[in-house]
């Protein structure tokens, strides 16, 4: 058993049929010595008396809020949560496996630049009685500070018969060094509590590996005289690290119709302009990627050819 | 060329060669990017590689103030990786595929380090740790880790030279 936060405790249980469970001793936080009784949740049934209560925790029925009283007055609470371990593996029932970039990916994180700011998100089908708390650090043995905000519900989607909820959190490294080569990864830890079930999820990454620039901005077209060609120009996204002579991007420019199967024109460039062939009913799209490190491409920025 | 006395390097040449190094480092093992090597316990292997750290003056302001600190750090790293790529980690079993770009990468690391420090001038170089894994699978894992780490190192070096070529070239 360990303390998650004040008056909230997590009991780690090996979860299998007829498992013996864990013996837990609760102590009432009071100077009083006698006349103390214990109850669980909303029930008035007295579970025991005395300053301490010893219970055998085997299942979710044994978890919940234990309260000690004296003469009708509440003295203190202890909330017990269960963390299940099945076949040596901690349960992952609360969050959905996003399977990208690999199986057992519950947390996904992205950064728009090298400032040390990043966003992580996760998915669940659970809609109520759900809380998350997020902690992060750079490195684990001698951790350096990363500050995370509160996790918020960022999107709701319908997937077949199920509703899916996306939660996200923003974090910022306290003393980020954008130009340095990271040697210790960022660690992100998410505590998830659904009713009386506790689970924790972790992710470890370098900012450089989760970089995904915003799309290029201000796409403009200039038709070239006596030619089918068009000069397309754009700018670095505002959110990208500066100076751009140091934090450089490379770009992919593509002209394509509405369908992926249609023919296309495509060119890669380090500049912020390119000449392409525009077709009726086609769009010109540009996306960006770090020039020197192969992290994710941005989403496309598009303008119609016409 | 960067010399210990402090004259400027051939920024544009260094820029071109460092960008080539980036391309080669990724083609040497593109799939490395998709392997989570941190799960394999890095500490004893790649913690010893020289990293370009916050105080090394490789940020835009540091380069403007005095690029020599940063160039020396990059030079140390280039020599370090050049020696690693020539060591039995890469030459031993399992043999590299003959079309692996590791050979080109090795030569380009040497080429850039020589651009930064012509013969006759000497900057301190970092001692290579004795990493000689006994098992072929350990060697394979170590190669991946070294290449992964090299990708990050040459990316920073390429940014330095691109910025230098754009803003510090005579």
């Amino acid at each position: 058993i360990w303390e998650l936060k004040k008056d909230v405790y997590v009991v780690e249980l090996d979860w299998y049929p007829d498992a013996p469970g864990e013996m837990v001793v609760l102590t009432c936080d009071t100077p009083e010595e006698d006349g103390i009784t214990w109850t669980l949740d909303q029930s008035s049934e007295v579970l025991g008396s005395g300053k301490t209560l010893t219970i055998q925790v085997k299942e979710f029925g044994d978890a919940g809020q234990y309260t000690c009283h004296k003469g009708g007055e509440v003295l203190s609470h202890s909330l017990l949560l269960l963390h299940k371990k099945e076949d040596g593996i901690w349960s992952t029932d609360i969050l959905k496996d996003q399977k990208e970039p690999k199986n057992k990916t519950f947390l996904r994180c992205e950064a728009k630049n090298y400032s040390g700011r990043f966003t992580c998100w996760w998915l669940t089908t659970i809609s109520t009685d759900l809380t998350f708390s997020v902690k992060s650090s750079r490195g684990s043995s001698d951790p350096q500070g990363v500050t995370c905000g509160a996790a918020t519900l960022s999107a709701e989607r319908v997937r077949g018969d199920n509703k899916e909820y996306e939660y996200s959190v923003e974090c910022q490294e306290d003393s980020a060094c954008p130009a340095a080569e990271e040697s210790l990864p960022i660690e992100v830890m998410v505590d998830a509590v659904h009713k009386l079930k506790y689970e924790n999820y972790t992710s470890s990454f370098f900012i450089r590996d989760i970089i995904k620039p915003d799309p290029p901005k201000n796409l403009q077209l200039k038709p070239l005289k006596n030619s089918r060609q068009v000069e397309v120009s754009w700018e670095y996204p505002d959110t990208w690290s500066t100076p751009h002579s140091y934090f450089s991007l490379t770009f992919c420019v593509q002209v394509q119709g509405k369908s992926k199967r249609e023919k296309k024109d495509r060119v890669f460039t380090d500049k912020t302009s390119a000449t392409v062939i525009c077709r009726k009913n086609a769009s010109i799209s540009v996306r960006a990627q770090d020039r020197y490190y192969s992290s994710s491409w941005s989403e496309w920025a598009s303008v119609p050819c016409s | 060329r960067a010399v210990p006395g402090g004259s400027s390097p051939a920024w544009t040449q260094c820029q071109q060669l460092s960008q080539k190094l980036c391309t080669l480092a990724w083609s040497a093992h593109p799939l490395v990017g998709h392997m989570d090597l941190r799960e394999e316990g890095d500490e004893e292997t790649t913690n010893d590689v020289p990293h370009i750290q916050c105080g090394d003056g490789c940020d835009p302001q540091g380069l403007r103030d005095n690029s020599q600190f940063c160039l020396q750090r990059i030079h140390q790293g280039l020599i370090f990786y050049e020696k690693l790529l020539g060591s039995d980690i890469f030459t031993g079993e399992p043999s590299l595929l003959p079309d692996s770009p590791v050979g080109q990468l090795h030569a380009s690391l040497l080429g850039l380090s020589q651009l930064l420090q012509p013969e006759g001038h000497h900057w301190e170089t970092q001692q290579i740790p004795s990493l000689s894994p006994s098992q072929p699978w350990q060697r394979l894992l170590l190669r991946f880790k070294i290449l992964r780490s090299l990708q990050a190192f040459v990316a920073v070096a390429a940014r330095v030279f691109a910025h230098g070529a754009a803003t510090l070239s005579p």
Partner: antibody
Framework: EVQLVQSGAEVKKPGATVKISCKAS????????LHWVRQRPEKGLEWMGW????????EYAPKFQGKVTITADTSTDTGYLELSSLRSEDTAVYYC???????????WGQGTLVTVSS | DIQMTQSPSSVSASVGDRVTITCRAS??????LHWYQQKPGKAPKLLIK???QSISGVPSRFSGSGSGTDFSLTINSLQPEDFATYYC?????????FGGGTKVEIK
């Protein structure tokens, strides 16, 4: 299977005009760009121009502007290259090539040898 | 126009050898570079697109690398059917241009 089959060899006199064809099969003709590439005897490859069969748009290499006309007939899935004012230096193998991507060549015809001789 | 210079213009090699052909552009072309193989009397065949992207059906012994102005095509463990002429082609801007070719001959 995507295929381009070109018309047979031609022998022409200087000053004449020649029109060679390239018949596409195995794909929807208007879904691919069609290019023409020249290869003179013992020489390298030279890109001449392209056509978008869907709308008839064309673009020519400046070197071949005015010299060649590229057309396409979607009813027969055939592309054409017309060379005018032939000279001996136009003696070459002419290839048609196609791709969904405009700037490189995925599928090639077998080539048509045009000989210009008096 | 962008000039493409291939070297060497010819190379003699034996079956099993590793052969590297280089291609240099007269200006930076990012990764807009493609490689073709041509055998005598036949049409060219696409081997590599965008500097390093493999083409389905092309043996994995063919690999490409480079960006900017310098590119290379490597044939690992040359096979009898690989004796041919190889061309690079830039697609950075029109007109599309080819290198002069590199003939790989039997030693």
């Amino acid at each position: 299977e995507v295929q381009l089959v070109q018309s047979g060899a031609e022998v022409k006199k200087p000053g004449a005009t020649v029109k060679i064809s390239c018949k596409a099969s195995g794909y929807t003709f208007s879904d691919y760009y069609l290019h023409w590439v020249r290869q003179r005897p013992e020489k390298g490859l030279e890109w001449m121009g392209w056509i978008d069969p869907e709308n008839g748009d064309t673009e020519y290499a400046p070197k071949f502007q005015g010299k060649v006309t590229i057309t396409a007939d979607t009813s027969t899935d055939t592309g054409y290259l017309e060379l005018s004012s032939l000279r001996s230096e136009d003696t070459a193998v002419y290839y048609c090539a196609a791709n969904k991507e405009l700037r490189y060549f995925d599928v090639w015809g077998q080539g048509t040898l045009v000989t210009v001789s008096s | 126009d962008i000039q493409m210079t291939q070297s060497p213009s010819s190379v003699s090699a034996s079956v099993g050898d590793r052969v590297t052909i280089t291609c240099r552009a007269s200006q930076s072309i990012s990764i807009n570079l493609h490689w073709y193989q041509q055998k005598p009397g036949k049409a060219p065949k696409l081997l590599i697109k965008f500097a390093s992207q493999s083409i389905s059906g092309v043996p994995s012994r063919f690999s490409g690398s480079g960006s900017g102005t310098d590119f290379s095509l490597t044939i690992n463990s040359l096979q009898p059917e690989d004796f041919a002429t190889y061309y690079c082609q830039q697609s950075n801007s029109f007109p599309l241009t080819f290198g002069g070719g590199t003939k790989v001959e039997i030693k």
